[in-house]
């Protein structure tokens, strides 16, 4: 049995898969901040995790996915306020008893040092310095992401 949060996550992922393919994003849109090959957008209001997930989708984006510790540190460097928490796209899957990213992959246990429990209705937030497990109903800010398309050099055959 999937929790309502897992259902919401799956529904959004499926609707995103159904949409027609858009041309690649070469530059970050206005108001978005570039971090390497991503564009990030930080919210200015608060929401529970599932509302945050849904709100990112209205911006044709997803809650932030973090590949590794290095990307976490670079993201945290963009956070200016010490005590503020932001939802990212990672929550506890009760059925698989593991932390699961909204793209369906599982957390590599070495990637993030999570403070708090791994249990039902737990979602992950980040601050300037740490990564926390919080009740998904907690009302905090969130970070959306869009992937930039890498520009590949065309290879021309010898003339």
């Amino acid at each position: 049995q999937k929790s309502s949060i897992e259902k919401c996550s799956v529904d959004i992922q499926q609707s995103r898969n159904k949409t027609t393919e858009r041309p690649g994003l070469l530059n970050c849109p206005i108001y978005w901040q570039q971090l390497r090959e991503k564009c990030l957008l930080f919210s200015h209001t608060v929401n529970p995790w599932n509302n945050s997930l849904a709100d990112c989708s209205t911006k044709e984006s997803s809650l932030l996915l973090i590949r590794d510790k290095d990307e976490l540190i670079h993201t945290q460097n963009l956070i200016r306020d010490k005590a503020i928490l932001f939802w990212i796209g990672l929550n506890f899957s009760l059925s698989e008893k593991n932390w699961k990213w909204i793209n369906g992959s599982f957390l590599n246990s070495n990637d993030l040092e999570i403070r708090g429990d791994a249990k039902e209705n737990s979602c992950i937030s980040i601050s300037q310095t740490s990564v926390y497990s919080e009740y998904c109903s907690t009302e905090i800010r969130w970070i959306c992401q869009k992937e930039l398309t890498p520009v590949r050099n065309k290879v021309y055959p010898d003339s």
């Epitope: 206005i30 108001y31 957008l41 930080f42 919210s43 200015h44 209001t45 608060v46 929401n47 529970p48 509302n51 709100d55 911006k59 200016r80 306020d81 503020i84 009302e139 905090i140 800010r141 959306c144």
Partner: antibody, heavy 120, light 107 residues
């Protein structure tokens, strides 16, 4: 058109509480975050905090954290700001202001203001 | 907290004049700066967001510029209805702060 209509002027004694209301019309009340900003006589503007009417979530300026409570009643599209343990320096005009975008911190519509006078 | 210092505090000008108001931030705020106009006894009115983007319905004589720590609001040709107070605001941090204001008076 978007309208934010606030409750009338209040006179309070030091130590008392005041509750100001802000009734929204002309847009989806739950679709925009409401903020409260105050302006003391002859002074600049000071941001107090926000409430997301959709979820009820709040975030307060640390300066007011122990004294302010922001609530809402979605059935009547109204936001409230209660400030307790009033002091004379809380004398100000209090505004509700709509956040224009979930991802930017500007206020695109304001109430007419509520004058709160704190005097013994 | 990020402090915003506006200058001048008072400005006397005539209809048709070009005027510039400056807002200096104590730290880099990128372009997360807003300008408001406020008339006596009235609520502030949004003019410009993101340092230079005019809000819907704001006349083109109002323009904003700047990034980092220095920002300006320019009114290219003052109209009688422009005499008012002007405030800048930053939202680079989640503790939003405002400048002290500039009172624009008729000379």
């Amino acid at each position: 058109q978007v309208q934010l209509v606030q409750s009338g002027a209040e006179v309070k004694k030091p130590g008392a509480s005041v509750k100001v209301s802000c009734k929204a019309s002309g847009y989806s009340f739950t679709g925009y975050t409401m903020n409260w900003v105050r302006q003391a006589p002859g002074q600049g503007l000071e941001w107090m905090g926000l409430i997301n009417p959709s979820s009820g979530g709040t975030y307060y300026n640390q300066k007011f954290k122990d004294r302010v409570t922001m609530t809402r009643d979605t059935s009547i599209s109204t936001a409230y700001m209660e400030l307790s343990r009033l002091r004379s320096d809380d004398t100000a005009v209090y505004y509700c202001a709509r956040l224009g975008d979930n991802y930017r911190g500007y206020f695109d519509s304001w109430g007419q203001g509520t004058t709160v006078t704190v005097s013994s | 907290d990020i402090q915003l210092t506006q200058s001048p505090s008072f400005l006397s000008a005539s209809v048709g004049d070009r005027v510039t108001i400056t807002c200096k931030a104590s730290q880099d705020v990128g372009t997360a700066v807003v300008w408001y106009q406020q008339k006596p006894g009235k609520a502030p009115k949004l003019l410009i967001d993101w340092a230079s983007i005019r809000h819907t319905g704001v006349p083109s004589r109002f323009s904003g510029s700047g990034s980092g720590t220095e920002f300006t609001l320019t009114i290219s040709s003052l109209q009688p209805e422009d005499f008012a107070d002007y405030f800048c605001q930053q939202y680079s941090t989640y503790l939003y702060t405002f400048g002290g204001g500039t009172k624009l008076e008729i000379k």
